[in-house]
Interface confidence: low
């Protein structure tokens, strides 16, 4: 029920904890020598997305056929360990966390496909992967070393009332400025009683620039 | 207690962290063997039951407590016997039931 | 006293999980007393039992030895199977010293 297992029977059994009374952090020093448990895989790093919300798989080798399946997500930071969602499931069905959480997910087969919503720049942090096999017996735990979701605040888009003055500003000048070279053109073509040729033409800015809208996640997958 | 009626047993563990551990009913009738009743997480999230008494038993756990209870209701005369309460010594692993309570007798007969 | 004994015990269905270990354990239930762990998952021996006492078998047939049986040794013998609920237990062995 621990990952105490260690002072009473040693690394002899290839099982997994029912529960979690140790901080992680002990856990995942002492899991690799002492609990060789159902193994969990995670890429290790995540960058969200500029609005927040980052994506990856959590996947686990099943040491059995379990039927109900139980995903928690943990947060790591400054070795505080934290909770951020959890979710129940029967195999073949969907994920469902609570309303208010911000996790969502899909289930497919041994694969979850977590998405946490509303990171800030303060969140980045570690997070952690926790499986349980809750039925049939014999229960099963397994924790994957971790995601290291990075969440970078994007710089604001500049002011659109601040874009249309510029805006206005640069087509003005730009009008007059062809107005002028216009002028001046027909004038000599007038002087000189040449045939009349095309004014010159300015390519026009796009009327709000774009602004980088959001960072693809990337991530490098544990073997 | 008499057949169809109520009764509820308390179990008071020490010497441990009860919250760590998932905690089993089993009942010995008089001259017979073990029978396994009841089992509960340690969060109290699962329960899983013996078919004899599916329905009519009810386990729990109190955390804050140290106490692990089972409401026994609508005895039968073939309820009779004494209920351990033992601890599932899976520190780590499945490691058996590590730890028992005396026991309680009950006695169902009109 | 000081003879080898030895208790069997068998299962109708396989006990080996898929992990590796056969979820059997073995109890003794002293007269008079609550039952107490001899051997957990098949061959791994409790905290605190003498190894006098082995544990020993898989999927479906499995083995109580003990090397010499001594006095405080009496009392039954309680297989049980831990792989799916509901947990079962053997009917008991019920052991003596002439």
């Known amino acids: 029920m621990a990952c105490l297992g260690f002072q009473r029977h040693k690394a002899q059994l290839n099982l997994a904890t029912r529960t979690w009374p140790c901080t992680l952090l002990f856990f995942l020093l002492f899991i690799p020598v002492f609990c060789k448990a159902m193994h969990v895989a995670q890429p290790a790093v995540v960058l969200a997305s500029s609005r927040g919300i980052a994506s990856f798989v959590c996947e686990y080798a099943s040491p059995g056929k379990a039927t109900e399946v139980r995903v928690t997500v943990l947060r790591q930071a400054d070795s505080q360990v934290t909770e951020v969602c959890a979710a129940t499931y029967m195999m073949g069905n969907e994920l469902t966390f609570l309303d208010d959480s911000i996790c969502t997910g899909t289930s497919s087969g041994n694969q979850v496909n977590l998405t946490i919503q509303g990171l800030r720049a303060m969140d980045t942090g570690l997070y952690i992967c926790k499986v349980e096999l809750m039925y049939p017996p014999p229960y099963y735990l397994g924790i994957g070393n971790g995601t290291q979701i990075y969440v970078i605040d994007p710089e604001p888009c500049p002011d659109s009332d601040f874009l249309l003055w510029i805006l206005a500003a640069v087509s003005s000048g730009l009008f007059f400025y062809s107005f002028l070279l216009t002028a001046v053109s027909l004038s000599k073509m007038l002087k000189k009683r040449s045939p009349l040729t095309t004014g010159v033409y300015v390519k026009m800015p796009p009327t709000e620039p774009e602004c980088e809208k959001q960072f693809q996640p990337y991530f490098i997958p544990i073997n | 207690v008499q057949p169809g009626r109520s009764l509820r047993l308390s179990c008071a563990a020490s010497?441990?962290?009860?919250?760590?551990?998932?905690m089993h009913w089993v009942r010995q009738a008089p001259g017979k063997g073990l029978e396994w009743v009841v089992v509960?997480?340690?969060?109290?999230?699962?329960?899983y039951y013996a078919e004899s008494v599916k329905g009519r038993f009810t386990i729990s756990r109190d955390n804050s407590k140290n106490t692990l209870y089972l409401q026994m209701n609508s005895l039968r005369a073939e309820d009779t016997a004494v209920y351990y309460c033992?601890?599932?010594?899976?520190?780590?692993?499945?490691?058996?039931?590590?730890?028992w309570g005396q026991g309680t007798l009950v006695t169902v007969s009109s | 006293p000081g003879e080898p004994a030895s208790i069997s015990c068998r299962s109708s269905q396989s006990l080996l999980h898929s992990n590796g270990y056969n979820y059997l354990d073995w109890y003794l239930q002293k007269p008079g007393q609550s039952p107490q762990l001899l051997i957990y998952l098949g061959s791994n021996r409790a905290s605190g039992v003498p190894d006098r006492f082995s544990g020993s078998g898989s999927g479906t047939d499995f083995t109580l030895k003990l090397s010499r049986v001594e006095a405080e040794d009496v009392g039954v013998y309680y297989c049980?199977?831990?792989?799916?609920?509901?947990?079962?237990f053997g009917g008991g062995t019920k052991v003596e010293i002439k």
């Open positions: 033992a601890r599932d010594q899976g520190t780590g692993w499945y490691g058996g039931f590590d730890f």
């Open positions: 509960i997480w340690h969060d109290g999230n699962n329960k």
């Open positions: 010497g441990f962290t009860f919250s760590n551990y998932a």
């Open positions: 049980m199977q831990a792989l799916q609920t509901p947990l079962t």
